[in-house]
């Protein structure tokens, strides 16, 4: 039985050219996290964090994706094309798979604020 819940940074905005932290947190379960996958809105994989092998950053994102903090992901040198949905998929044992959603809006405006509140999607 899957008892856990995924908390995410929810809907966030960030400035073009800046950086943003994508963060998911799995709570209310003792399940062991074996792998976390980070996907973009078009379902392309940005990065994988595997418990045995570590972080794998996909070649297309190597220059502007940094692991962490924790199991999160830092997306750098933001462009308008980065606007959209991001998904964290937690593969756990014995529970199975948990999935969280974050919506990122990249703004031209210099007053863009990065909202970092945690919320359950």
């Amino acid at each position: 039985m899957m008892t856990g819940t995924i908390e995410t940074t929810g809907n966030i905005s960030a400035k073009k050219g800046g950086s943003v932290i994508l963060q998911c947190h799995l709570s209310s379960t003792m399940a062991q996290v074996t792998q976390v996958n980070w996907e973009q809105h078009d379902h392309s994989l940005l990065a994988i964090r595997n418990a045995e092998l570590g972080w794998h950053i996909y070649p297309a994102f190597k220059d502007r994706v940094a692991p962490g903090p924790g199991l999160g992901l830092t997306l750098q040198s933001l462009t308008m094309n980065d606007t959209g949905e991001y998904f964290c998929t937690y593969h756990t044992y014995p529970d199975g798979t948990y999935r969280g959603r974050i919506f990122l809006e990249v703004l031209e405006s210099s007053v863009a604020e990065h909202s970092a509140r945690f919320q359950i999607p």
């Epitope: 045995e52 092998l53 570590g54 794998h56």
Partner: antibody, heavy 119, light 107 residues
Amino acid sequence: QVQLVESGGGLVQPGRSLRLSCAASGFTFRDYAMHWVRQAPGKGLEWVSGITWNSGLIGYADSVKGRFTISRDNAKNSLYLQMNSLRAEDTALYYCAKPVPRLRGLDVWGQGTMVTVSS
Amino acid sequence: DIQLTQSPSSVSASVGDRVTITCRASQGISSWLAWYQQKPGKAPKLLIYGASSLQSGVPSRFSGSGSGTDFTLTISSLQPEDFATYYCQQAFYLPWTFGGGTKVEIK
């Protein structure tokens, strides 16, 4: 006791292929990621490739990417390294290694199998 | 890829000496660093994992420290059996990488 035994090494011409095997015993093979590490004569250690317990994630050193393929057969407690388009610089002693669970240090190593690429 | 730079590449020391080997990563790797000892004709032996955790059966004169990009392996009092080559290895990012090695020789 925990043991890893490599085999399949030998003398091969540049451009040819070779398949290395590693037979594991003394531990539950299917529970562990596994790795290949090599050492050229008189040189340092070079990580070659790693594979998760279920083959779900695989990594390669840039020097072998596209030429080498790591695989495993959990039913046979065996790890493999298929080496294609071999080059002189692939000449090395190839070790199979097992990690400390989830801590990523390699705590058990085989004795190694020597691969010599020469015409 | 992460480059690991070990220094010195070799060190001459005497029995009883304190020996320090450093390993610097080209990017932060948290604490995902291991240290190995290798003697001629033998497979490497794991000494330290997680930057500072001593592998079972390894003498307490070996210790590791550091986090992020700078790491240290210390042998508090060198013993005759410690003359060997030492390697650091990162496991934060794929591909994993090793340092170039440090040879500890008899002075």
